[in-house]
């Protein structure tokens, strides 16, 4: 039996700059029941607070609701482990909510097969930003990627679309069913998960790719 090992805050994420969650790895428990608490202070303040919500985001986590989240302040967060033999603390982690945003995937992915005047066919891919994202006001600047592949293929073909919420894909194989997904990333944050797949079958009635 021994004091607990040092815990580690291994991830903090916000879906929208309005709430966020931090998760920790407990470390060894020293063979004894061990209690974990997350404490934090904010830049320029001496007061230390305890995690407002240990439940919402699951085990070994702390959820900060709107009431406790500010993008104007740095959070200095520590996890403390305590058992009968002693205690240990994680290294403090400095969290700027601007830099931990991982949004929901884009919505309303639509696929349309179109034809140019010269009979060249292309796939027009369109989507909407995630619901929670206030892109119009500049609160978020979002970048996007799409990926697509023939249904049976292993490898995805990825296209970065910048800030555009639509993209035209040329030179696809006729008669093939294609799977398409999209994802987004805010200016300083992390890529979202890929959206659910949408599929489309390219028509047969145009010239085959070389």
């Amino acid at each position: 039996q021994s004091p607990p090992g040092k815990p580690e805050i291994h991830k903090c994420r916000s879906p929208d700059k309005e709430t966020f969650t931090c998760w920790w790895n407990p470390g060894t428990d020293g063979g004894l029941p061990t209690n974990y608490s997350l404490t934090y202070s904010k830049e320029g303040e001496k007061t230390t607070y305890e995690c407002p919500d240990y439940k919402t985001s699951g085990p070994n986590s702390c959820f900060f609701s709107k009431q406790y989240t500010s993008i104007w302040k740095i959070y200095i967060i520590t996890v403390n482990a305590t058992n009968q033999m002693g205690s240990s603390s994680s290294d403090p982690l400095y969290v700027d909510v601007t830099y931990i945003v991982e949004p929901e995937p884009p919505r309303n992915l639509t696929l349309e097969v179109k034809q140019l005047k010269d009979k060249k066919t292309y796939l027009w891919v369109k989507w909407s930003p995630p619901t929670i994202t206030d892109v119009k006001t500049g609160w978020f600047t979002m970048e996007y990627e799409i990926r697509l592949k023939p249904e049976e293929a292993e490898e995805w073909e990825i296209h970065f679309t910048g800030h555009q919420t639509q993209f035209k894909v040329f030179d696809l194989y006729p008669g093939q069913k294609y799977l398409v997904q999209t994802r987004c990333k805010p200016d300083h944050g992390y890529w979202s998960r890929w959206s659910q797949e949408s599929s489309v079958e390219m028509p047969n009635d145009f010239t085959l790719k070389d």
Partner: antibody, heavy 118, light 112 residues
Framework: QVQLQQPGAELVRPGTSVKLSCKAS????????MHWVKQRPGQGLEWIGV????????NYNQKFKGKATLTVNTSSSTAYMHLSSLTSEDSAVYYC???????????WGQGTLVTVSA | DVVMTQTPFSLPVSLGDQASISCRSS???????????LHWYLQKPGQSPKLLIY???NRFSGVPDRFSGSGSGTDFTLKISRVEAEDLELYFC?????????FGGGTKLEIK
């Protein structure tokens, strides 16, 4: 505790390339971006670029595009920077540095001195 | 790129005196989120830099309170209220509001 280990020095010939390593320990490697910074002898610091080890997404200082390539090996928790077509201007100390979830550098490697000499 | 101009290049001081280092940016360092990402680092010979102050005025963990930062917009100052022997090192300001992140040229604090 968080540690970033870098080799002390590399001596390389002009026109060749070098791959610098930065082995991370004491934290979850894929959770934090890794930056690279250049310091020429007796001079200031220059930010080269950053890589997100979770998906290898990179962002470079325009000045170093084509010169530096950032990669990671998540299984060994190691970040790499490949420098190509080396000239005397590339002789410098190169640091890897990690922020927290913030945009400053909390942890630094000890730096690798790259000397480009015939 | 944002140019960070530090003055003076070298600052002779007596132990116990106050030292003041200035840093000026070529454009405003106020981020679109309202924060100002101006930081100060200290570097000892043969070592990597260490963070002293983040976001203009916040002392990093373990930094003595004789170090303080101030300023806004494009003009910033690092003050050391009572210089000690261990403070006679190289200081850099740095901005991370705009990509690429940039650094000042450095100020060497030395004994008068």
């Amino acid at each position: 505790q968080v540690q970033l280990q870098q080799p002390g020095a590399e001596l390389v010939r002009p026109g060749t390339s070098v791959k610098l390593s930065c082995k991370a320990s004491g934290y979850t490697f894929t959770s934090f971006w890794m930056h690279w910074v250049k310091q020429r002898p007796g001079q200031g610091l220059e930010w080269i670029g950053v890589i997100d080890p979770s998906d290898s997404h990179t962002n470079y200082n325009q000045k170093f595009k084509g010169k530096a390539t950032l990669t990671v090996n998540t299984s060994s928790s190691t970040a790499y920077m490949h420098l190509s077509s080396l000239t005397s201007e590339d002789s410098a100390v190169y640091y890897c540095a990690r922020g927290d979830y913030s945009n400053w550098f909390t942890y630094w490697g000890q730096g690798t001195l790259v000397t480009v000499s015939a | 790129d944002v140019v960070m101009t530090q003055t003076p290049f070298s600052l002779p001081v007596s132990l116990g005196d106050q030292a003041s280092i200035s840093c000026r940016s070529s454009q405003s360092l106020v981020h679109s989120n309202g924060n100002t990402y101006l930081h100060w680092y200290l570097q000892k010979p043969g070592q990597s830099p260490k963070l002293l102050i983040y976001k203009v005025s916040n002392r990093f963990s373990g930094v003595p309170d004789r170090f303080s930062g101030s300023g806004s917009g494009t003009d910033f100052t690092l003050k050391i209220s009572r210089v000690e022997a261990e403070d006679l090192e190289l200081y850099f300001c740095s901005q991370s509001t705009h990509v690429p992140w940039t650094f000042g040229g450095g100020t060497k604090l030395e004994i008068k």
